[in-house]
Interface confidence: low
């Protein structure tokens, strides 16, 4: 480690004095100190002498001697005070720039250590420091404002009490720069735009940042637009706004518009699409099939997507029959806006009743006219079955009627004993009727089919069962011949409540 002579940490001299600082090391040595006049440097191998014959207050400062060849980077320092009764301060820099939350050193060096007790930091024009300014003082280095804030960007002066009066330093301007977190924040309004040819339009591109140094521009299909910029400082942010006003749009104005802002941290951009159309439009669509089948008692939501410009002037859901003249309750109709020109309309049909099957139409109107989209809702029912004994063309016949939707399939079973329902162990014979006769098949109604089983002689200790099933469920009816006549009944479990 180099050694400085005189071997004291501080040296106090008067203006005009001769000062000689000698540094000796193992190898070559170098001096480092505040830039000040009148110093002469003599180097001689492993020693270096810094001297002046006329010390001034500007020589006040810390002088450090280093040995560049020393791998440990050792150094020695001495602080020189040149105590000038007229000049209590030596200001090393008149402008200090730091980022927010860094410590800011205002380098006003005290020229006389005796004055330390009476020093203070003030703002120019005799103003006190802002409240909550946290600072400390070192006679060797000056005042340090800790964790400086942007609002502390001020002109400061160091004050010392000399003979009962305050003597100020020249001013030091502190610039506290905002830490820029990234590229400017951007907004481009609207996110999408549609206009009819000849209408007016406005597109607003705005950017904001904590720092004023950023650029913003609006481009149309990669062409930068020349638009006057409005600037403001609001809520501690700088804002720059570009407003494109089009009095009468035409097809050449359509296309992609990009708002681009950049600063030292990088670039942000956001885009929107402007569509120019010849006339008003209204398009209805649905992601659902327009033909819907739902089991009775269940619920269904019908959804219609609407794309329109200008906006809708009216819309409603209508039930077109064929059953009652009821209309959908308004509370079950819901509208949601996906964006400016696209909307979704939903009709909720909970716990569907038989009378609610049929056609549901969504109608919408805008200056482009009326449009409608119609759903056909068919209800699914499990089969209902009944069996009767009759004579057809002189032959004894069991007649089974099954009603449901979709169309039920029919199976006949003959089993031993008297029972409400044939089980596998009792079954003697099974007949599938591949083509039952369709008695009725109207839209939105149940399909009723009829199946005939010709029986030459009824066995009295046997049961004949007609079973019908479809995708929703099944139903059955057992026929038990009795000597006094035929007896028929459905199984106990057949109860249908929609």
């Amino acid at each position: 480690i180099p050694v400085i002579e005189p071997s004291v940490p501080e040296l106090v001299v008067k203006p005009g004095a001769t000062v000689t600082l000698r540094c000796v090391g193992n190898g070559s040595v170098e001096w480092d100190g505040p830039p000040s006049p009148h110093w002469t440097l003599y180097s001689d191998g492993s020693s270096s002498i810094l001297s002046t014959n006329n010390a001034t207050f500007q020589n006040t400062g810390t002088y450090r001697c280093t040995e560049p060849g020393d791998p440990l980077g050792g150094s020695a320092a001495i602080h020189l005070y040149v105590k000038d009764p007229a000049r209590p301060w030596n200001v090393l820099a008149q402008e200090v720039v730091v980022f927010e939350d860094q410590d800011a050193l205002l380098p006003c060096l005290l020229t006389d250590p005796v004055l330390e007790a009476g020093v203070s930091l003030v703002r120019v024009r005799g103003r006190p420091l802002m409240r909550h300014t946290n600072y400390s003082f070192s006679p060797w280095h000056g005042f340090t404002i800790h964790r400086a804030k942007f609002i502390q960007s001020q002109d400061y002066q160091c004050s010392a009490l000399m003979g009962g009066r305050k003597v100020m330093s020249i001013s030091i301007r502190l610039k506290v720069q905002k830490v820029i977190p990234g590229p400017p924040a951007l907004t481009l309004v609207p996110a999408e735009l549609v206009r009819i040819r000849g209408e007016a339009a406005q597109i607003v591109c705005s950017a904001s940042s904590v720092d004023v140094n950023f650029d913003v521009f609006l481009q149309h299909n990669n062409t930068k637009l020349a638009i006057p910029q409005q600037s403001d400082f609001h809520n501690n942010r700088y804002q720059k706004v570009l407003t494109l006003n089009l009095d009468q749009v035409d097809f050449q104005h359509a296309g992609n518009y990009s708002c681009v802002a950049s600063n030292v941290q990088g670039k942000h951009s956001t885009s929107m699409f402007f569509r120019v159309v010849e006339s008003a439009y209204l398009n209805l669509s649905s992601e659902q099939n327009l033909i819907q089948e739902v089991t009775v008692g269940e619920g269904l939501n019908l959804k219609v997507m609407v794309e329109a410009y200008p906006g809708l002037q009216g819309f409603n859901w209508t039930y077109l029959g064929p059953f009652s003249d009821h209309q959908p309750e308004p509370k079950l109709a819901n509208a949601t806006t996906k964006d400016t020109y696209r909307h979704t309309f939903t009709l909720s049909l909970p716990r569907l009743k038989p009378s609610e099957a049929g056609r549901y139409s969504f109608l919408a109107r805008n200056p482009g006219g009326w449009r409608a989209l119609t759903f056909e809702l068919t209800l699914r029912y499990p089969p209902e079955v009944s069996v009767i004994w009759t004579f057809i063309n002189g032959s004894g016949t069991l007649l089974c009627a099954a009603s449901g939707y979709p169309q039920p399939n029919v199976t006949w079973l003959q089993c031993s004993g008297h029972t409400d329902r044939c089980d596998e162990a009792q079954v003697l014979q099974v007949w599938d009727d591949p083509y039952p006769e369709v008695l009725s098949q109207e839209p939105f109604h149940k399909v009723t089919v009829q199946s005939l089983l010709t029986v030459e002689t009824l066995e009295h200790n046997q049961t004949y069962e007609c079973r019908a099933h479809n995708s929703v469920g099944s139903g059955s009816w057992a026929f038990i011949p009795i000597s006094a006549g035929a007896h028929t009944h459905p199984p106990d479990e057949f109860l249908f409540t929609p």
Epitope: R125, D155, S171, D232, F233, N235, N236
Partner: antibody
């Protein structure tokens, strides 16, 4: 000593023009956001407009009644603020003050000139 | 624009008594990021320019007597003169500096009863 001194006021006919000046001293003018505030006889205070420091972009803002007719500019080398008033109307008759706020106070005005009277009359 | 409404228009108070002036802004002048209200109070005596009394709604400017105090937040603010002195006879204005255009209240004339 901190000081703002306005000049250039006087009598002018409706439709005429006038240029007000404001000489600043005793503080760092180039760092200041400078405003003009006016006061019609017997009335309250009305903000006219503002110019920011060059380091803050040097942009201007105006109150609606004067927008498009008045222009604020500054010459930092001369420590002078200007208000160019065109198309003057009788309702522009007022004492016009040059004012600024300590930088940290933003636009709370702690330094005011004595004002200069502008009279618009035929 | 933010509209500043002062009340009352005029106020007569005995020497040594308390004077209270209210100011209401049409929208909040509190900036949540630094929790500061961008509101100032001024005193104007005849033939003189206005003098800043209070900034940030409640901070007295240097040299302003401590009988002057400001309070309030958001949209409702109050200037209080705790003990009226003869030299306090003046017109008092509130002003928002939250956004441009900067706007002043209509003023409150304080007189001695």
């Amino acid at each position: 000593e901190v000081q703002l001194v306005e000049s250039g006021g006087g009598l002018v006919k409706p439709g005429g023009s006038l240029r007000l000046s404001c000489a600043a001293s005793g503080f760092t003018f180039s760092n200041a956001w400078m405003s003009w505030v006016r006061q019609a006889p017997g009335k309250g205070l009305e903000w006219v407009g503002r110019i920011k420091s060059k380091t803050d972009g040097g942009t201007t803002d105006y109150a609606a009644p004067v927008k498009g007719r008045f222009t604020i500019s500054r010459d930092d080398s001369k420590n002078t603020l200007y208000l160019q008033m065109n198309s003057l109307k009788t309702e522009d008759t007022a004492v016009h003050y040059c004012t600024t706020g300590d930088y940290s106070y933003t636009d709370a005005f702690d330094i005011w000139g004595q004002g200069t009277m502008v009279t618009v009359s035929s | 624009d933010i509209v500043m409404t002062q009340s009352p228009d005029s106020l007569a108070v005995s020497l040594g008594e308390r004077a209270t002036i209210n100011c209401k802004s049409s929208q909040s002048v509190l900036y949540s990021s630094n929790n500061k209200n961008y509101l100032a109070w001024y005193q104007q005596k005849p033939g003189q320019p206005p003098k800043l009394l209070i900034f940030w709604a409640s901070t007295r400017d240097s040299g302003v007597p401590d009988r002057f105090s400001g309070s309030g937040s958001g949209t409702d603010f109050t200037l209080t003169i705790s003990s009226l002195q003869a030299e306090d006879v003046a017109v008092y204005y509130c002003q928002q500096y939250y956004s441009t255009p900067l706007t002043f209240g209509g003023g409150t004339k304080v007189e001695i009863k």
